[in-house]
Interface confidence: low
């Protein structure tokens, strides 16, 4: 069981003799008289497992100590940190020639984690370890240990694991700590890209290229890459990620915009306060919701204030000229905060008796310069019917008018066009024909164009050919023409008159009076 010790973030420990609870139980050769496991206490009353050897009096020492199998965990290069004490031969009397001040470090790669014996010829020498002058003093109760630290590396490794071995050739040594580790570039976040734990390369100069993945709520701008150096340091960041819409960078993370803020696009910008007349109620808003009665047009940027439809145009003035009308008005008091204001004209033809009964004017009416999308505040409307009630509405519209469910931004005016001469009468009928009279009836003109004041009937004998005619006037739509000659063909024309004058005569109606004292009832345009 291994207890936890704190080491640099870029080092991954594979073996730490100081963290082993209980005896290490490494294999020594020879089994006795060479390396011996000794436990000492450090200043915190914690046992330190050491291996010691001090056969400085006897010549030709060859004492081996081998660790347990150490897994490689995918590392190609490992580091061995040895903390040890080494007695100065000068401090030991009578050992000249047999005392040594170095030991040798070996390794052996193996897929077998249960090798029981030390076969010296399998091991590859890493280095000869000597005590240098740099040491630390460790207080172990009433004694001070001068602790040397040496680090060596070995690689590339390829098998599943390896064994380390320490060869003593006649020194007085205490191995206080053996730590085996590999280096990695630790998980890190740069430019909003997360780079995973990455084991360093096989040799001390290699760089491992690593592609980063964007942190939560972000996306790539340029492919994020970094290089993992042999010492476990990240080098040369390239590319970056940007926080998604609705998120901003805070402490190396993409955090949701706070309530009342938003971010519309994936950029490196921070969240912005909601524009005027808008709000957000959730964190992470990509746009702000418009206040009630305010809207955002399709092509409005999220950064634009929400706007309103305009109020009604002001001061609508009409000028009637026979069957045309000129309208002028002033801009609305409130444009809704937008520049794209225009005007639409709605024309309704209304009954004289009941102004509420209005119908659209239809396609016969013409507007100058146009009916909809007017940028000016005047319009001329022509080809109206005479003597007719019209209601004209001027609607102020802008880019958000279409979103308003209850539009009230119009002003209206009702006008009556001037009277004009009526149109001609389409149908004249002889209702009754006798020897001396003809009873006529007709329809009102299609377009009276005003109040019909009277009708005028012009008639003459057919063979006189209008050289000698008579006129009869009546307010009704029928009349009896008396005093005619029997058995004579007459031609009748009827026209209507308004205050504006007479209309055109109707098409001629030819009727022949009878010879006998009986009555002929007629219905057609020509009765004989």
């Amino acid at each position: 069981v291994t207890g936890s010790r704190v080491y640099p973030a870029n080092e991954v420990t594979l073996l730490d003799s100081r963290s082993v609870q209980g005896e290490l139980g490494w294999i020594a050769s020879p089994l006795e008289g060479g390396w011996e496991e000794v436990s000492i206490m450090d200043e915190k009353n914690t046992p330190i497992r050491t291996y010691q050897v001090c056969n400085v009096m006897e010549p030709s020492q060859n004492n081996w100590l081998r660790t347990d199998w150490i897994t490689r965990e995918g590392a190609q290069r490992v580091y061995i940190e040895i903390k040890f004490t080494l007695r100065d031969c000068n401090s030991l009397p009578g050992v000249m020639g047999t005392c040594k001040e170095t030991f040798n470090l070996y390794y052996y790669e193996s897929d077998n984690d249960k090798e029981r014996f030390i076969r010296e010829n399998q091991f590859v020498k890493i280095d000869t370890i000597a005590a240098d002058e740099s040491f630390t003093q460790v207080d172990i109760g009433d004694r001070i240990m001068k602790l040397n630290t040496e680090i060596r590396d070995v690689g590339p490794l390829s098998k599943k694991g390896f064994y380390l071995a320490f060869q003593d050739v006649g020194a007085c040594i205490a191995l206080v700590s053996v730590r085996v580790f590999y280096k990695k570039c630790p998980l890190t976040v740069r430019n909003l890209a997360q780079f995973p734990d990455t084991i360093t390369g096989a040799d001390t100069s290699s760089l491992v290229e690593v592609r980063g993945s964007c942190v939560n709520n972000s996306e790539e701008k340029d492919v994020p890459k970094m290089y993992c150096g042999a010492d476990g340091e990240w080098l040369v960041p390239i590319g970056n990620c940007l926080c998604n819409a609705g998120h901003e960078e805070r402490s190396g993370e993409c955090q949701a915009c706070k309530i009342g803020y938003y971010k519309a696009l994936s950029t490196d910008a921070t969240c912005a306060k909601c524009p005027p007349h808008s709000y957000s109620v959730w964190e992470g808003a990509t746009s702000c919701t418009c206040d009630r009665g305010f809207f955002r047009a399709d092509n409005d940027a999220a950064s634009m204030p929400c706007t309103r439809p305009p109020s009604a145009p002001l001061n609508l003035i009409s000028n009637v000229n026979e069957t045309s009308v000129n309208l002028e008005w002033s801009s609305p008091q409130n444009t809704g905060g937008r520049q794209d204001i225009s005007y639409n004209v709605v024309c309704k033809k209304c009954g004289a008796g009941d102004p509420s009964k209005c119908r659209p004017c239809g396609s016969g009416v013409h507007y100058t310069p146009q009916q909809n999308g007017l940028k000016t505040t005047k319009v001329s409307i022509t080809d109206l019917l005479a003597h007719t009630n019209y209601t004209f509405e001027i609607w102020a519209v802008n880019g958000v008018s279409k979103y308003n469910p209850n539009p009230d931004q119009s002003v209206s005016v009702t006008v009556t066009t001037n009277q004009a001469a009526p149109s001609s009468i389409a149908l004249v009928q002889a209702k009754e024909v006798t020897r001396y009279s003809v009873a006529l009836a007709w329809l009102e003109p299609d377009r009276p164009n005003g109040v019909i004041l009277e009708y005028e009937v012009k008639y003459y004998e057919k063979d006189q050919n209008e050289r000698s005619y008579r006129i009869v006037r009546t307010a009704a739509r029928n009349t009896d023409i008396k005093g005619l000659n029997p058995l004579t063909s007459y031609v009748f024309h009827v026209r209507a008159r308004t205050a504006a004058g007479y209309g055109d005569f109707s098409e001629p109606l030819e009727v022949t009076t009878n010879t006998v004292p009986s009555r002929i009832i007629g219905d057609g345009a020509n009765s004989t």
Partner: antibody, heavy 124, light 107 residues
Framework: QIQLVQSGSELKKPGASVKVSCKAS????????MHWVRQAPGQGLKWMGW????????TYAQGFTGRFVFSLDTSVSTAYLQISSLKAEDTAVYYC?????????????????WGQGTTVTVSS | DIQMTQSPSSLSASVGDRVTITCRAS??????LAWYQQKPGKAPKLLLY???NLADGVPSRFSGSGSGTDYTLTISSLQSEDFATYYC?????????FGQGTKVEIK
């Protein structure tokens, strides 16, 4: 038919734990966040917080952290409220209620569907 | 946190009466307000949302008005089934708090 069906009443001793379930049906569970509301006897309604049914991330209102845990089992469209170390003042009716997880066109939030409520009584 | 203050806390009325309940927020909640009806032993039922919008299936005698901090629920002609407790709730930034409730009782 859209409904939230809650587990039945619970009688617990102080210090015990309780887990209230809220099973959703008639709609896509992950389209709506699930909220929890407490109503103590004779009292008004108090919003406890909510859980994101897509990510499982809970958000707790002040006063409902520590002993209260919101969780989900999306495979059975069910949200859970667990209360540990129960106290007498936890005696209340607990309601679940749904709210759209995203805008879906609505510019305003409201609890349109509620569970029938689960009565939790804590008494020695 | 935003506080919601309802008034009155209770009222007595007769069938056919016009009843008005008010709800005041401690700051502008921009119409992010819902009204609920709760009958004894039952879950709350949504009446109105966005201050004025009638929820599906709710009779038209219920209406809402208001903006900024002051909101009103009106029952134009009280019916026997309307005797209940009414709550307002804001949705303007968490925590979403409720009013303390208004109990409408039979006179």
């Amino acid at each position: 038919q859209i409904q939230l069906v809650q587990s039945g009443s619970e009688l617990k001793k102080p210090g015990a734990s309780v887990k209230v379930s809220c099973k959703a049906s008639g709609y896509t569970f992950t389209d709506y966040s699930m909220h929890w509301v407490r109503q103590a006897p004779g009292q008004g309604l108090k919003w406890m917080g909510w859980i994101n049914t897509e990510t499982g991330e809970p958000t707790y209102a002040q006063g409902f952290t520590g002993r209260f845990v919101f969780s989900l089992d999306t495979s059975v469209s069910t949200a859970y409220l667990q209360i540990s170390s129960l106290k007498a003042e936890d005696t209340a009716v607990y309601y679940c209620a749904r709210i759209p997880l995203y805008y879906y066109g609505s510019r305003y939030w409201y609890f349109d569907v509620w569970g029938q409520g689960t009565t939790v009584t804590v008494s020695s | 946190d935003i506080q919601m203050t309802q008034s009155p806390s209770s009222l007595s009325a007769s069938v056919g009466d016009r009843v008005t309940i008010t709800c005041r927020a401690s700051e502008n909640i921009y119409r992010n307000l819902a009204w609920y009806q709760q009958k004894p032993g039952k879950a709350p039922k949504l009446l109105l949302y966005a201050a004025t919008n009638l929820a599906d299936g709710v009779p038209s005698r219920f209406s809402g008005s208001g903006s900024g901090t002051d909101y009103t629920l009106t029952i134009s002609s009280l019916q026997s089934e309307d005797f209940a407790t009414y709550y307002c709730q804001h949705f303007w930034g968490t925590p979403w708090t409720f009013g303390q409730g208004t109990k409408v009782e039979i006179k």
